[in-house]
């Protein structure tokens, strides 16, 4: 039952003009000599949003992005000329597009850019304290960016910097063919995925990387990569894309003979996000676009939100699927994919799996294997030839929590906020699109907490011209959303309660967990507030039960739209 398939109409539809006039958006419209404001790093402590763009890195004040500092980091004329002579576009390609921007330590960030098809990295000093107001490039210390940033600005890097080590999924060559997951920096030898083996990675596009603990023992920590890639022949008829989750042990140092300086614990599994079709054939949303991890009380089990689109040119659709880490782990503990039989088909591997099971992190938890270099040859050879799992990971409830079809846009980004409301906690999704709009959606349980209904609260246009939203960050501290695109950066509050109208019924019908009727206006709901007059009903949106102030009036039929 897809309530979400009906392309439900937003409670509020706000144009860019309306957003501006109601002071609900602040925009930084970019610099004349820059673009591609795609790489975000949120620093709640310093109250800064760092943004990597073309030839620039910005430090925006989270309170108001109109207040910013900038670092100019272009390439030399020589580099730019070399790039041009290699047949690249001088404006779109022969510049330093920032692709990696991570916190390195208490005082520095680590940044990498394409360097006009010659990747380069450096450190940025930001100081110890917010009041230090330091933001400067360490131009005395540049590092080779190969395996950290792609050469081509059209490609993304999924990166994660932990304990002084940079994990990155990117293309490591000029041609953009040698895609790999790397670990660089730190004191150890760089490690990467096996080269020229399509079983490991098959022309992937990396989305994001996350550290997720496996147990209470930090030795078991894993880094998970989300990406999409071409399905290997035999997995699918015709050319198809598969969404993937890949895992690597943080303490993987490669093999002792085979897989030397290569991951020995890399495994990947397919992420399914599909709906049953009328003809019995599922419609798959395979083009993974973005991932957001919603942390729970248990750091081992965040909820994974994924934004997907269809591969089809005929049928344009987007979906949001949720995954549980326990389901992911179950798949990684399941059968490995193995090619066998007369047609060389993928089948579940039925033979003896070596010990310790490939993909297990070496630790005291599992039999005293202190390092991946200590693994016996059979574990390494098996790992090398069986990087994929046979079973896919299905979403929670085996279906998307939201789908959008036959609309003129597709989803590109997602962030999620967990909001305390009068009747429980709700996850509010902010979904960016390829036309510069943001959808604000709340998941509301129907009969059970498993059966979710999507309520589309708002559809906001946040850029003057239609543009693909390529980055989003949410500040719970500031209660603001920050949005990046080629054109610039936008900032908007997470809630606009006053826009829902001047009556209790309208406030209640909005079903926005951020908002409640306080007796005189629709305003921000705080669960700690003692006011008994707070009226809110996210689950049912029923004003009759919750509004006894006669505020139902004849306005109930036109609360839906602002044009």
């Amino acid at each position: 039952n897809y309530a979400n398939g009906k392309n439900n109409v937003p409670r509020l539809k706000l144009s860019y003009k309306e957003m501006l006039e109601s002071n609900n958006v602040i925009t930084f419209n970019g610099l004349a000599n820059s673009s591609s404001y795609h790489t975000f790093l949120l620093d709640e402590e310093r109250s800064r949003l760092y943004v990597g763009a073309k030839d620039h890195i910005f430090s925006f004040n989270l309170v108001n992005i109109k207040d910013f500092q900038k670092i100019v980091w272009p390439v030399s004329y020589t580099r730019r000329d070399e790039c041009k002579w290699a047949g690249k576009d001088i404006l779109k390609e022969c510049a330093n597009f920032i692709k990696v921007l991570k916190a390195y330590n208490q005082t520095h960030l680590y940044a990498c850019g394409t360097g006009a098809f010659h990747p380069i990295c450096t450190y940025i000093e930001v100081g110890h304290h917010p009041e230090d107001n330091i933001f400067k490039l360490q131009d005395s210390h540049f590092e080779n960016g190969r395996g950290k940033s792609p050469y081509d600005p059209k490609l993304l890097t999924a990166s994660l910097l932990i304990d002084g080590e940079l994990y990155s999924g990117t293309a490591a060559d000029f041609m953009g063919r040698d895609f790999a997951i790397f670990r660089t920096l730190g004191h150890h030898h760089p490690i990467r995925t096996e080269q020229h083996d399509s079983r490991w990675l098959n022309d992937p596009r990396f989305i994001s990387a996350h550290l997720i603990p496996e147990s209470d023992n930090p030795e078991d920590d894993k880094v998970y990569f989300f990406f999409r890639e071409n399905a290997i022949d035999g997995e699918h008829s015709g050319k198809a894309t598969h969404a993937r989750i890949g895992q690597i042990c943080k303490n993987d140092f490669g093999g002792h003979r085979s897989l030397v300086n290569k991951w020995t614990t890399f495994l990947k599994a397919r992420l399914i996000c599909s709906v049953p079709g009328p003809n019995g054939i599922d419609t798959h949303f395979d083009e993974l676009q973005d991932v957001f991890l919603m942390n729970s009380k248990d750091p081992k089990n965040p909820i994974v939100y994924g934004v997907f689109t269809t591969s089809s040119n005929i049928f344009k659709g987007s979906a949001v699927c949720m995954y549980s880490m326990s389901d992911v782990r179950r798949v990684f503990l399941g059968p490995y994919a193995h090619r066998d039989g007369p047609n060389y088909q993928w089948v579940p591997y039925q033979g003896r799996v070596p010990y310790p099971r490939p993909g297990t992190c070496p630790s005291k938890t599992f039999g005293g294997f202190d390092s991946t270099k200590d693994l016996p040859d059979d574990v390494i050879t098996f790992a090398r030839s069986h990087p994929a799992m046979y079973n896919p990971v299905f979403p929670i409830n085996n279906r998307p929590i939201m789908i959008k079809t036959d609309v003129n846009y597709q989803f590109t980004q997602i962030v999620v906020d967990r909001v305390d409301a009068e009747d429980g906690q709700y996850d509010v999704m902010f979904i960016g699109t390829d036309v510069g709009t943001v959808l604000k959606v709340v998941s509301v349980p129907k009969e059970t907490w498993h059966d979710l209904e999507e309520v589309l609260l708002e559809e906001m246009t946040v850029f003057r011209e239609p543009t693909t939203i390529s980055a989003m960050e949410l500040s719970t501290k500031q209660q603001q959303l920050y949005i990046g695109s080629t054109a610039g950066v936008a900032q908007l509050p997470l809630h606009r309660c006053d826009i829902y109208g001047k009556a209790c019924a309208e406030c209640c019908l909005a079903r926005d967990p951020y908002c409640a009727w306080d007796g005189s206006s629709c305003s921000r709901y705080f669960p700690t507030a003692k006011a008994r007059t707070r009226a809110q009903d996210i689950r049912n949106g029923d004003p009759l039960t919750h509004c006894s102030d006669g505020g139902i009036e004849g306005r109930m039929d036109h609360h839906h739209h602002h044009h």
Epitope: R257, R352, P354, G367, F369, D374, L375, P376, D378, T381
Partner: antibody, heavy 117, light 107 residues
């Protein structure tokens, strides 16, 4: 120079037990897998057991599983093989071997175990 | 388990001749094959590891080749001290297994 010296072999009754020891020197003992390989009179070589560097896990063929236990004391540079429920077919020369993660590069001179009925 | 078949069981040659010993695996084992030499009353010693890697201290006349299922140990020109029993061993997967051996004897 790598040296492996086995001891503890001898004559034992059917169903009896025996503990073999191997004193290692000339290399960093704790940095290597260690193994036991045996050779029945006039026969070929048979792998008996391999233990990982830390001693936390060991591998056995079905022929000795649940009867033999390999162990090591890295502080004493010593490898052990505890053999229980001995059978006539366990009669062999038992070699202590350095390696087992890959190839077995150094072998002791062996100790003879004879199981009599 | 992986079965290793060595052939011939006995090879009779004269000093100075070339010896070719074969080892066949029941399934593909990549290059995870090692060769050992054993003389009467002595412990085996490692000659070649991972199919073709030579060991320091082992004469250059010993060489190994092959991968997958078929492997060869070659002694280019036999010396009197080379007459012994030769074993192959797979390290591809547990349980480790040895071939039955090839006895190289003086003709």
């Amino acid at each position: 120079e790598v040296q492996l010296v086995e001891s503890g072999g001898g004559l034992v009754q059917l169903g009896g037990s025996l503990r073999l020891s191997c004193a290692a020197s000339g290399f960093t003992f704790s940095s290597y897998y260690m193994s036991w390989v045996r050779q029945a009179p006039g026969k070929g070589l048979e792998w008996v057991s391999t233990i990982i560097k830390s001693g936390g896990y060991a591998y056995y063929p079905d022929s000795v599983k649940d009867r033999f236990t390999i162990s090591r004391d890295n502080s004493k540079n010593t490898l052990y093989l505890q053999m229980n429920s001995l059978r006539a077919e366990d009669t062999a020369v038992y070699y202590c071997v350095k390696g087992g993660q890959g190839a077995m590069d150094y072998w002791g001179q062996g100790t003879t175990v004879t199981v009599s009925s | 388990e992986i079965v290793l078949t060595q052939s011939p069981a006995t090879l009779s040659l004269s000093p100075g001749e070339r010896a070719t010993l074969s080892c066949r695996a029941s399934q593909s084992i990549g290059d995870y094959l090692h060769w050992y030499q054993q003389k009467p009353g002595q412990a085996p010693r490692l000659l070649i590891y991972y199919a073709s890697q030579s060991i320091s201290g082992i004469p250059a006349r010993f060489s190994g080749s092959g991968s997958g299922t078929d492997f060869t140990l070659t002694i280019s020109s036999l010396e009197p001290e080379d007459f012994a029993v030769y074993y192959c061993q797979q390290g591809y997967s547990f349980p480790y297994t040895f071939g039955g051996g090839t006895k190289l004897e003086i003709k």
